[in-house]
């Protein structure tokens, strides 16, 4: 099986050839396709843990506007993981977005 940070090159033979995730993408392994990192900032959140090639970023809600002294504020916002809004590749076995010409005429 493809390890963390890599993905199958051939959806019909997963785990045979595994390529590294492209920049800005991650895969936890186990033959999963790489997905784009979540951009916590764009999601309006803080980055609690940055992404890597094997795991997504972990985001947390921004603190609400301070309306009381710091020492009486409640506990920090609970960390949440924001799912990527789009996956890469868009489908692991779907049609290619670039025409594929296979020797022998098969598509």
């Amino acid at each position: 099986r493809c390890r963390a940070g890599t993905q199958p090159l051939d959806s019909y033979k997963p785990g045979v050839d595994c390529a590294p995730c492209p920049p800005g993408h991650f895969s936890p392994g186990d033959n999963q396709a790489c997905k784009p990192w979540t951009n916590c900032t764009l999601a309006g959140k803080h980055t609690l843990q940055p992404a890597s090639n094997s795991s997504d970023a972990i985001c947390e809600d921004r603190d609400p506007p301070a309306t009381q002294p710091q020492e009486t504020q409640g506990p920090p916002a609970r960390p949440i993981t924001v799912q990527p809004t789009e996956a890469w590749p868009r489908t692991s076995q779907g049609p290619s977005t670039r025409p594929v010409e296979v020797p022998g005429g098969r598509a």
């Epitope: 993905q7 090159l9 050839d17 790489c34 951009n39």
Partner: antibody, heavy 121, light 107 residues
């Protein structure tokens, strides 16, 4: 049509920095990883690194990790490659190249015209 | 790093000839190999990816084969516009690496 247009030739002194730009058109810039490859005079191709415009995530060749910085400006669909602490052996043609979008294959289907960087005292 | 060794480094051929260029990887790269054509003063152009899949618009006289460590680019009938330098590239692992190139010259 899909096009990558790079900035003009640069002549730099050793120890200085250079920033090369690559303006993309004809496709959705943020959806395609942009890579940088260089070619010294009469030599082969050397991969520098790549960046995903959607989230700014980047991967570098360790040979360039400390000196190369890849950035993007999504508002102008432009990628940048800055190389610092230049030395004479950095004299080369620098190319931006779009990673093909056909699944997990890390090849380059569209290239810029190249930017010549000359490092000389 | 994975080394990609091309041979020959240069060759002379005539229009109509069958030309074969080989690329040997220093370790198993599966089928994660691409081939490019570069003409003097120009950027490389993608010919083949996934060892044997022709990129859009590439003439059928170009074909690729191989897996593991040994790969071949074949031009079945050399045309005047094919005189150029050809590079292989592996993408099974970072850093992405290229072969040293094979220059195809007119005999």
């Amino acid at each position: 049509q899909v096009q990558l247009v790079q900035s003009g030739a640069e002549v730099k002194k050793p120890g200085s920095s250079v920033k090369v730009s690559c303006k993309a058109s004809g496709y959705t810039f943020k959806d395609y990883t942009m890579h940088w490859v260089r070619q010294a005079p009469g030599q082969g191709l050397e991969w520098i690194g790549g960046i995903y415009p959607n989230n700014g995530g980047s991967t570098y060749n360790q040979n360039f990790k400390d000196r190369a910085t890849l950035t993007v400006d999504k508002s102008t669909s432009t990628a940048y490659m800055e190389l610092s602490s230049l030395r004479s052996e950095d004299t080369a043609v620098y190319y931006c190249a779009r990673m093909g979008y056909h699944g997990p294959h890390l090849d380059f289907d569209v290239w810029g015209q190249g930017t010549t960087v000359t490092v000389s005292s | 790093d994975i080394q990609m060794t091309q041979s020959p480094s240069s060759l002379s051929a005539s229009v109509g000839d069958r030309v074969t260029i080989t690329c040997k990887a220093s370790q198993d790269v599966g089928a994660a190999v691409a081939w490019y054509q570069q003409k003097p003063g120009k950027a490389p152009k993608l010919l083949i990816y996934w060892a044997s899949t022709r990129h859009t618009g590439v003439p059928s006289r170009f074909s690729g084969s191989g897996s593991g460590t040994d790969f071949t680019l074949t031009i079945s009938s050399l045309q005047p516009e094919d005189f150029a330098t050809y590079y292989c590239q592996q993408y099974i692992n970072y850093p992405l690496t290229f072969g040293g190139g094979t220059k195809v010259e007119i005999k």
